[in-house]
């Protein structure tokens, strides 16, 4: 039985050219996390954090994606095209797969505030 829940940074906004942290947290389960996948809105993989191998950033994103903090992901040099959904997929044993969603809005405005709140989707 899957007892865990994924908490995410929810809906966030950040300035064009700036950076943002995408964060998911799995709680309420003793399941072992074997791998975390980070996907973009078009379902292309940004990065994988395998418990044994460590981080792998996909080549197309190596210049703009940094691993961490923790199992999260930092997106840098944001462009308007980065606006959209991001998904974290936690592969666990024995529970199975948990999935969290974050929506990122990249704003042109120089006064855009970086808003982030933890929420359970």
């Amino acid at each position: 039985m899957m007892t865990g829940t994924i908490e995410t940074t929810g809906n966030i906004s950040a300035k064009k050219g700036g950076s943002v942290i995408l964060q998911c947290h799995l709680s309420s389960t003793m399941a072992q996390v074997t791998q975390v996948n980070w996907e973009q809105h078009d379902h292309s993989l940004l990065a994988i954090r395998n418990a044994e191998l460590g981080w792998h950033i996909y080549p197309a994103f190596k210049d703009r994606v940094a691993p961490g903090p923790g199992l999260g992901l930092t997106l840098q040099s944001l462009t308007m095209n980065d606006t959209g959904e991001y998904f974290c997929t936690y592969h666990t044993y024995p529970d199975g797969t948990y999935r969290g969603r974050i929506f990122l809005e990249v704003l042109e405005s120089s006064v855009a505030e970086h808003s982030a709140r933890f929420q359970i989707p």
Epitope: Q32, N50, E52, L53, P59, T92, Y93, P94
Partner: antibody, heavy 124, light 108 residues
Framework: EVQLLESGGGLVQPGGSLRLSCAAS????????MSWVRQAPGKGLEWVSA????????WHADSVKGRFTISRDNSKNTLYLQMNSLRAEDTAVYYC?????????????????WGQGTLVTVSS | EIVMTQSPATLSVSPGERATLSCRAS??????LAWYQQKPGQAPRLLIY???TRATGIPARFSGSGSGTEFTLTISSLQSEDFAVYYC??????????FGGGTKVEIK
């Protein structure tokens, strides 16, 4: 700490059989893919067989297909390689190795953790 | 079966120098390539996977590059513990998963 300990190697005549075992500890054995890789004396590495975490899927190199069978007992945290119709060219150190992937993540077929190996000698 | 060819068979290098090892696949393996180090009497040690990603705990002096059919492992400044045999391995999604014949890095 991940540990893989092979046993069951030894001297066997051509046409004979051996069963290798690999006792795993230090990790949750069940979900992870496992493989056997061998190395003939003074030679390079050769992948032999692989098995999924559940044991439902197996893969074998053409050189051993129909002669070798990989299996696992997740309740005993043990991997096996049943070797039949052995030939001189099967003489090698046999390593068991852990895949970083699971049934859920998919398998990598690369290996960070290896056992120390067990020597199989096929000779009359 | 995809054939992996490593060159040179032996590389003589002085400590502190750079070592460049090559691996060629008989057909494209995309970035599905790993590098291992093996010392006498020991099991192989995974260094690099996905052609260029270092495995956890591997020193930064080891780096990998290439894609398709041509790959390189570079050791930027050889330490005494780096003298060993190095193998490349392809792991395209379907078996068999094949290794190169190895490159022995020895002290010059």
């Amino acid at each position: 700490e991940v540990q893989l300990l092979e046993s069951g190697g030894g001297l066997v005549q051509p046409g004979g059989s051996l069963r290798l075992s690999c006792a795993a500890s230090g990790f949750t054995f069940g979900p992870y893919g496992m493989s056997w890789v061998r190395q003939a004396p003074g030679k390079g590495l050769e992948w032999v067989s692989a098995i999924s975490g559940s044991g439902a899927s197996t893969w074998h190199a053409d050189s051993v297909k129909g002669r070798f069978t990989i299996s696992r007992d997740n309740s005993k945290n043990t991997l096996y390689l049943q070797m039949n119709s052995l030939r001189a060219e099967d003489t090698a150190v046999y390593y068991c190795a852990k895949d970083p992937g699971t049934d859920s993540t998919g398998y990598y077929y690369i290996w960070r953790y290896w056992g120390q190996g067990t020597l199989v000698t096929v000779s009359s | 079966e995809i054939v992996m060819t490593q060159s040179p068979a032996t590389l003589s290098v002085s400590p502190g120098e750079r070592a460049t090892l090559s691996c060629r696949a008989s057909q494209s393996v995309s970035s599905n390539l790993a590098w291992y180090q093996q010392k006498p009497g020991q099991a192989p040690r995974l260094l690099i996977y996905s052609a260029s990603t270092r495995a956890t705990g591997i020193p930064a002096r080891f780096s990998g590059s290439g894609s398709g059919t041509e790959f390189t492992l570079t050791i930027s400044s050889l330490q005494s513990e780096d003298f060993a045999v190095y193998y490349c391995q392809q792991y395209v999604p379907h078996p068999p998963f094949t290794f190169g014949g190895g490159t022995k890095v020895e002290i010059k």
